[in-house]
Each structure stands twice: as C-alpha cells, then as structure tokens.
C-alpha cells in the first residue's frame, strides 16, 4: 500500500493507524494517498517540522495518547485538505503560534485533555473554517478577548474543566453560528450581562459545576433557540423572575445541587418544549400555586432532597402530561388532597423520606395511571379506605419503613395487600410498629384474632376490594417499573470524544433501580 | 367467637343452579375475605372464588358458572353454582380470611337425575 | 396454575414419635420475602381447620407441637410428637396467586 511502515497498519480506505509504545516518531514513509492517519498510544515527545509532507491528501488526522509535549510550528504544513485534527489527550501545555496557519480547510480541532495555560487570539485567526473546537480538559486560567473572533463559522465550542474564574462579556460575541457552548467544571462565579447575546443560534450552554452565585435577569435573553440548558451544581441562591422568560425551545433544564430556596410562581416560562426539571438537591422549602403552570409538556419534576414542608394545592396546576414526580426525602408531613389531582398522566411518585402522618383518602384520586408509588419511611400509622382501589396499573408500592399500626383498623390494608400481592414489587414488607404484643411482625402475616380493637371505631369498613382486576383469569404481567422509576442524575447528552463524567447517583430519584436522580 | 353458619343439603338435578349461603357472625363481617372451597366425596380441597366488599376473584373452572354475592346487612355470603353436572356433588364449604382461619361446617350439594 | 405435590399419600406413626409431610410447589410461592404456604387439618366428616400459615405461623389455638418450615418451593408439616387426636388428613395450599390450589392430602394414621 504505496509503503507502510512497519509499526502501522494501512488499509485499502487509504486509512492508516500507529499505535504502540515502540514509536516514539512519526513513523516514515507514510503513503503519500493516505486520507487518514491515527497515532495512538505512542512515546511520541514532539512533532518537528513538516513530518506529514508528503501526505498531502490528508483528511483527518488523530494524534492521541501520546507524550507529546512540544511541537514545532511548522508541524503540519502542506496539510490543506486536512478537516479534522485531533491533538487530545496528550501533554501539551503550549500551542507555538502559527501552529494551524494553512489549515484552510480544517473543521474540527481537538485539543482537549493536555495542559494548555494559555490561548491567544493568533492561534486561531487562521481556522476561519473551524466548525468545532474541543478545549476542554486543560489549565486554562483565562480566555483573551478576540481569542475566537475569526471563527465566525464555530458551530460547537468546549470550554468545560478549565481553571476559568471569570468570562469576558465580549469573548463570544462574533460566535453568531455557535450552537453549542460548554463551560462545565470550571471556577466561574457570575456570567456578566450579555456574554451570550450574539449566540443567536445557541441550542446548548452547558454551564454545570461551577460557582455561579447569581444568574443576571437578562441573561439568556436572546437566546431563542436554545434547547438544553445545565445550570446544576452551582451556589444558584435565586432566580430573578425574567431570567427564563425568552427560551421557548427549551427542553432541558438542569437546576439541581444549587441553593435555591424559592420558587416564584411564573419563574418558568413559557417553556412548551419542556420535558424534564431537575432541581433535586436544593433548599426549597414550599411550593406556590402555579408555579409550574408554563411548563404544559413536562414529564419529569425532580424536586427531591429539598425541604420542602408545605405543597400549595395548585402548586401542580398545567402538569398535564407530568409522568415522573420525585418529592422524596423532604419535610412533608402533610398533603391536600387535591394536590396531584392535575396530574392525570402521572405514572411514578416518590414520597418516601418524608414525615407524611397520614393521607388524604382522595390523594390518587384523579391518576389513574399509577404504576408506582413509594411511601417507605414516613409517619403513616394507617392508609385510608380505597386509596388504592382504582390504580388499575399499579405494580409497585413501597409500603415499608413507617409505623404500622395493627390494630383492627389495619385490616382493610393488610387484606388490600394479600389479595393484590401478585402486582407489587417485592420489596421489603410492611412491618407493625404498634401494639407492642405485635411489634416486628409483619403486617400481612399478623394474627388477626389477636389484633387488638380499634379505639375509635367498632365497625371498621374495608376497602371496597375490587382486586384490581376484578374476575379476569390470572393477574397480569408484574414487570416493575423500576427500570424507569429511579433515573441517574441526568446525563448531559454530549458526544465529544472526551464525554462528561456525571455522578451516577442513585438515590435521587429513589422510585426504582433506574428512578433515581 | 367467629362462626359461619351454612345453609342446608341440596339436592339437584344436571343443569339446574343450586345457591348456599353462609352467615358470619362474631366478627367485623366487611374486614375479611370470604373464601368458597369445595371437595367431592373422598377427594381433595379445590378453590372456588371469593369475595371482599363486592369484590371477587373466580378459580378460571368455575368462571361463567360460580357467582358470590354478598348481603351486609346480614352479614351473609351466598355462592350460586349454575349448569349443574354429576361431578359437581361435592361437600361446599365456605372460609373466612385471607388465610382460611375459620370454616363453615360445609353444604353437601348432589347432583343427580 | 401452580401445583402442589404433598408426600407421602398416607403416614404411619406411633404414638409419641415425629410425623414429617413434605409439600413442593410447582414454582415458588414466595413473595415479599414470605412464603405463603398454608397447612390444615380435616379429621373425617369435619371442615378443615388452619394449622399453619405463611409458612410457619401458627394458627389461634394450634398445639405448639405442630409446626411448618420451608421457603421457595419445598415445606414441611411437622407434629413433633403424634397424639392420638392428630389423626387426620393434611392438606398443603399455596395463597401467592390465584387459583390458591391444594395439595392431595396426606393421611397421618397411628403404627
């Protein structure tokens, strides 16, 4: 194949690939119609001048997972049909400028996971082709003004976990076709006012992990198209009322491990697109009416691990196609009854970790569609008569970790479970609290002719059975909806080579294995 | 204490409906199942149905012909067994609770020509 | 439906001595970590009457000498020490899904 050395292997695509401690130079000669070339895993240092010259068809060209630290700036010369280069993951902390001069036709440049300090306006005003540019992984301290003024074509630009403490309001404002902006994992407290104005095209600003204290109310504001917004783990305290105001396209929203306590009604919106909110993980204390009534597409709400204490009744109002409701682990002791009576599409709910003392008899009155519903570690003593009795799909109940008490009023619940037991996960069982002659038994497999009387009532009424599936042959398939119940913390949909590393947190969600988060 | 008290032997002829109740008394009659369990002469126990608070559950052999309903204001069970055949002659027992904790003294039913 | 095996059909032994009736399921009648497997007593021309439930509880006013183990699939009956008034059939059930269905029965005679 027109030559190739003996540490590659050449492929009739005009592909070649050298990997292997061994090589510690461009290996030589390399086929002159080579289109792509990949240096993977070598002991390569440095990069002198002109070692691809005579590989001038070159289209793509990956130098990866190497020791190099130095590289001449003359490097890749006589590469004009190059459209992809990757320098990642290799130990460079400085780029000689000039380095890219002649790549007119270059696209794509990745120099993500090395040790740059520095970039400089004149590293890139050759690129002026450049679509994407991949920075992420590096020590960069600042960003100049003017350092991304020539790519006026960038479509994608990464910027994620750097050592950046502050932004240039003008640093992006040539970037009118950038769509995806990433500023992850850096040192950043506050955005200053218009930083994002000219990113008219923006769909995604990814700005998680920082420390970002106050979002400025017009922040977003000429961001129409923009789709994905992750603003989680930050010291977020408030929202000014505007700030979401302008973003109809947005369909996800990251708000979770900052510190908001609030949520003003209205603070979200207009958003049609909206599909899921995450703001587990924050210090809310109530919910006001209506304060989600923009969001008429949302599935998921993710309000876990807050302290919430107090649900206004109309907090759920426009969930209509809510499927996914996290509330756990908070500071609820009660609920009124027409909280989730909005919610007629509701499928997953997750109370447990709260200090619910009892529930309204009509709680699930209106969602029928329940499969799951995790009340485990509250207060309940007792469920009400027929709680359950229409949720036709439900296949799992957490039931487990309250204190039962199994008097004769325990009954209709302890029959409610035996005869629908086929439905429900399997989960730990309900467990007697009180009397003490029953303590640490089972609910289902208690004594009924020692349950001691009710004190309040002599004639308790059950709940009116119904099995769910009143005469039909054999129950029906008990699949858990775990595997949708418990989601991961959300993963941030990037397809960088260098993807982001996002907690896999279990016990967000808490609804089933794959309803955490 | 809990009874249930069943009502007397029937005697059928194939393809009539025979009906047998079982009146609980001693307890909270709304708070547990009522189970019907039959077993032919010098044979085996076989579940039937039950019933909870209107609520039932048929064993799919006995589904179209066994119906269980229920009177609360006299804390009754009656099951009706319709399209009678010879091998439905059989003792009819009635049981309370999930776990059939308390048994009536059982209904003989013959079905003959 | 599951089916429960009861062995052995029918049990001779002296008075004083253990009585042990085995009963398999044809799957497991386990769930929420019990299992529900049901024991009875039906002496001739008697209803049945509940020994043992979920396995290893025992009914009101059953004799400690009667006793049940097992879980998943495999459980035992066992009377410790026969008296003359266990003479009886014994009937196995499982109540994890319906139909509950019964074992065939084992009748425990005196040697």
């Known amino acids: 194949y027109h030559g190739c050395p003996s540490e590659c292997t050449c492929s009739r695509a005009s592909q070649v690939e050298c990997t292997g401690a061994r090589i510690v130079a461009v290996p030589t000669p390399l086929p002159w119609n080579a289109m792509s070339l990949q240096i993977l895993n070598t002991h390569i240092t440095e990069l002198n001048e002109s070692p691809f010259l005579n590989i001038s068809a070159l289209i793509a060209l990956r130098i990866e997972k190497n020791e190099l630290s130095r590289i001449t700036p003359g490097a890749f010369r006589n590469l004009g049909s190059l459209r992809y280069l990757s320098l990642a993951n290799n130990k460079l902390q400085v780029l000689p400028i000039g380095l890219f001069q002649g790549l007119d036709s270059l696209e794509s440049l990745l120099l993500s996971s090395n040790q740059l300090l520095q970039i400089q306006p004149a590293h890139f005003s050759q690129c002026s082709n450049l679509k994407e540019l991949q920075l992420h992984g590096n020590h960069l301290e600042y960003i100049p003004d003017g350092a991304f003024d020539h790519l006026v074509g960038l479509t994608k630009l990464n910027l994620g976990k750097n050592s950046l403490t502050h932004i240039s309001p003008r640093v992006f404002q040539h970037l009118g076709n950038l769509q995806v902006l990433r500023l992850y994992e850096n040192r950043l407290t506050d955005i200053p006012m218009g930083t994002f104005d000219g990113l008219v095209n923006l769909q995604e600003l990814a700005l998680q992990q920082n420390q970002i204290g106050l979002l400025s109310p017009g922040l977003f504001h000429n961001n129409h198209n923009l789709q994905r917004l992750y603003l989680s783990n930050n010291h977020i305290s408030q929202l000014p009322p505007s700030v979401f105001m302008q973003l109809p396209q947005l369909n996800r929203l990251t708000l979770f491990g900052n510190s908001l306590k609030e949520l003003s009604p209205g603070i979200f919106g207009p958003m049609p697109n909206l599909r899921e909110l995450w703001l587990y993980d924050n210090h809310i204390s109530s919910l006001p009416d209506n304060v989600f009534s923009n969001l008429r597409q949302l599935q998921v709400l993710i309000l876990s691990r807050n302290q919430i204490s107090f649900i206004s009744p109309g907090a759920f109002n426009g969930l209509t196609e809510l499927r996914e409701l996290s509330l756990h682990t908070n500071a609820l002791q009660d609920l009124d009854g027409n909280v989730f009576r909005m919610l007629a599409n509701l499928q997953n709910i997750s109370l447990q970790n709260n200090r619910l003392r009892q529930l309204p008899g009509n709680i699930f009155a209106n969602v029928n569609g329940l499969m799951a519903i995790q009340l485990q570690n509250n207060q309940l003593e007792n469920l009400p008569l027929g709680i359950f009795d229409h949720l036709g799909k439900l296949c799992e109940l957490r039931l487990y970790d309250n204190p039962w008490r199994c008097d004769s009023d325990i009954l209709p619940l302890r029959n409610w479970l035996l005869l629908n037991q086929p439905r429900l996960g399997t989960d730990t069982v309900p467990v007697c609290f009180s009397p003490a002659n029953v303590r640490g038994q089972s609910l289902i497999i208690i004594n009924v002719n020692v349950a001691v009387p009710s004190v309040h009532v002599p004639e308790v009424p059950s709940y009116p059975e119904t099995p769910w599936y009143p005469d039909t042959p054999s129950y029906p398939d008990t699949t858990s909806v775990s595997s949708t119940t418990e989601l991961t913390s959300p993963v941030e949909d990037y397809t960088d080579l260098t993807t982001i590393q996002v907690t896999d947190d279990r016990s967000v969600w808490g609804m089933t294995q794959a309803q955490s988060g | 204490q809990v009874q249930l008290v069943q009502s007397g032997a029937e005697v059928k002829k194939p393809g009539a409906s025979v009906k047998v109740s079982c009146k609980a008394s001693?307890?909270?009659?709304?708070?547990?199942?009522i189970h019907w369990v039959r077993q032919a002469p010098g044979q085996g126990l076989e579940w039937i149905s039950y019933?909870?608070?209107?609520?039932?559950k048929y064993n799919e052999r006995f589904r179209g012909r066994a119906t269980l309903t229920s009177d609360k204001s006299t804390s009754t069970v009656y099951m009706e067994l319709s399209s009678l055949r010879s091998e439905d002659t059989a003792v009819y027992y009635c049981?309370?609770?999930?776990?059939?904790?308390?048994w009536g003294q059982g209904t003989l039913v013959t079905v003959s020509s | 439906d599951i089916v429960m095996t009861q062995s052995p059909d029918s049990l001779a032994v002296s008075l004083g001595e253990r009585a042990t009736i085995n009963c398999r399921a044809s799957e497991s009648v386990d769930y929420y970590g019990i299992s529900f497997m049901n024991w009875y007593q039906q002496k001739p021309g008697q209803p049945p009457k509940l020994l043992i439930y979920a396995a290893s509880n025992q009914g009101s006013g059953v004799p400690d000498r009667f006793s049940g183990s097992g879980s998943g699939t495999d459980f035992t009956l066992t009377i410790s020490s026969l008296q003359a008034e266990d003479v009886a059939v014994y009937y196995c059930q499982q109540s994890k899904e319906v139909p509950y269905t019964f074992g065939g029965g084992t009748k425990v005679e005196i040697k």
């Open positions: 001693g307890y909270t009659f709304t708070s547990f199942v």
């Open positions: 049981a309370r609770d999930y776990y059939f904790d308390y």
């Open positions: 019933i909870y608070n209107d609520g039932t």
